[in-house]
């Protein structure tokens, strides 16, 4: 069985008050993506459904924007946004693929992007 791979933006950092794009990409599979969920630890941020489009959780509507693509843009970052984010790809027939991103929001103006990595 050929299974896919989730590529994410990995460990990233951004400046307080700024914005950041969270991106995941599913490759090496012909599975059909039916839905992508974005979660911050134990909170649902957004859903992108293949048929119904985007839904942003009400509590994040002011600071979360859909896209680009299946990614998610976080705006007006605060230090409380530091933590783990998960992209969850619901596919058929493979099942569910999960990618992890760690975001660190920095007080200083020095914010470097980490290297991309893959979760097999």
């Amino acid at each position: 069985m050929m299974t896919g791979t989730i590529e994410t933006t990995g460990n990233i950092s951004a400046e307080k008050g700024g914005s950041i794009i969270l991106q995941c990409h599913l490759s090496s599979t012909t599975a059909q993506v039916t839905q992508v969920n974005w979660e911050q630890q134990d909170q649902l941020l957004a859903i992108c459904n293949a048929d119904l489009g985007w839904h942003i959780s009400p509590s994040f509507k002011d600071r979360v924007a859909p896209g680009p693509g299946l990614g998610l843009t976080l705006q007006s970052l605060t230090v409380n946004d530091t933590g783990e984010y998960f992209c969850i790809y619901h596919t058929y027939p493979d099942g569910t693929y999960t990618g992890r991103i760690f975001l660190e929001v920095l007080e200083s103006s020095v914010a470097e992007h980490g290297a991309r990595f893959q979760i097999p």
């Epitope: 791979t5 969920n37 619901h90 099942g95 569910t96 693929y97 992890r100």
Partner: nanobody, 131 residues
């Protein structure tokens, strides 16, 4: 120590229904992949259904083509139990049914019935469907 215990198997006529239960002990729920597999005599073990439940309590089920529309997998965290509701049973559904689970927060892709390498397995419950 994590333990999975299946129950609910038995003998049933074709067209009938059964509900299998898999009760977990020593297992925590966070970001979980759990599923049901089966093995008929002389055949390889095959995936039936899996359920992915996130830390935000969203869930997604995936089914093998052979059971889609007939079987339903669900999880009751409060009862530490995963269920497999089996309707419109066929003689070819006869097999030993096993519950499987990944360690919590293990990211092992994909969570689906075609993936064989789950971390924990139960002892199985027998389902026999006669025509």
């Amino acid at each position: 120590e994590v333990q999975l215990a299946e129950s609910g198997g038995g003998s049933v006529q074709a067209g009938g229904s059964l509900r299998l239960s898999c009760t977990t002990s020593g297992y925590t729920y966070s970001r979980n992949c759990m599923g049901w597999f089966r093995q008929a005599p002389g055949k390889e073990r095959e995936g039936v259904a899996t359920i992915y439940v996130s830390a935000a309590s969203t869930s997604f089920a995936t089914y093998a083509d052979s059971v889609k529309g007939r079987f339903t997998i669900s999880l009751d965290k409060a009862k530490n139990t995963v269920y497999l509701q089996m309707n419109s049973l066929k003689p070819e559904d006869t097999a030993m049914y096993y519950c499987a689970a990944d360690p919590p927060d293990r990211i092992s892709n994909p969570c689906g019935p075609r993936r064989p390498d789950f971390g924990y397995w139960g002892q199985g419950t027998q389902v026999t469907v006669s025509s």
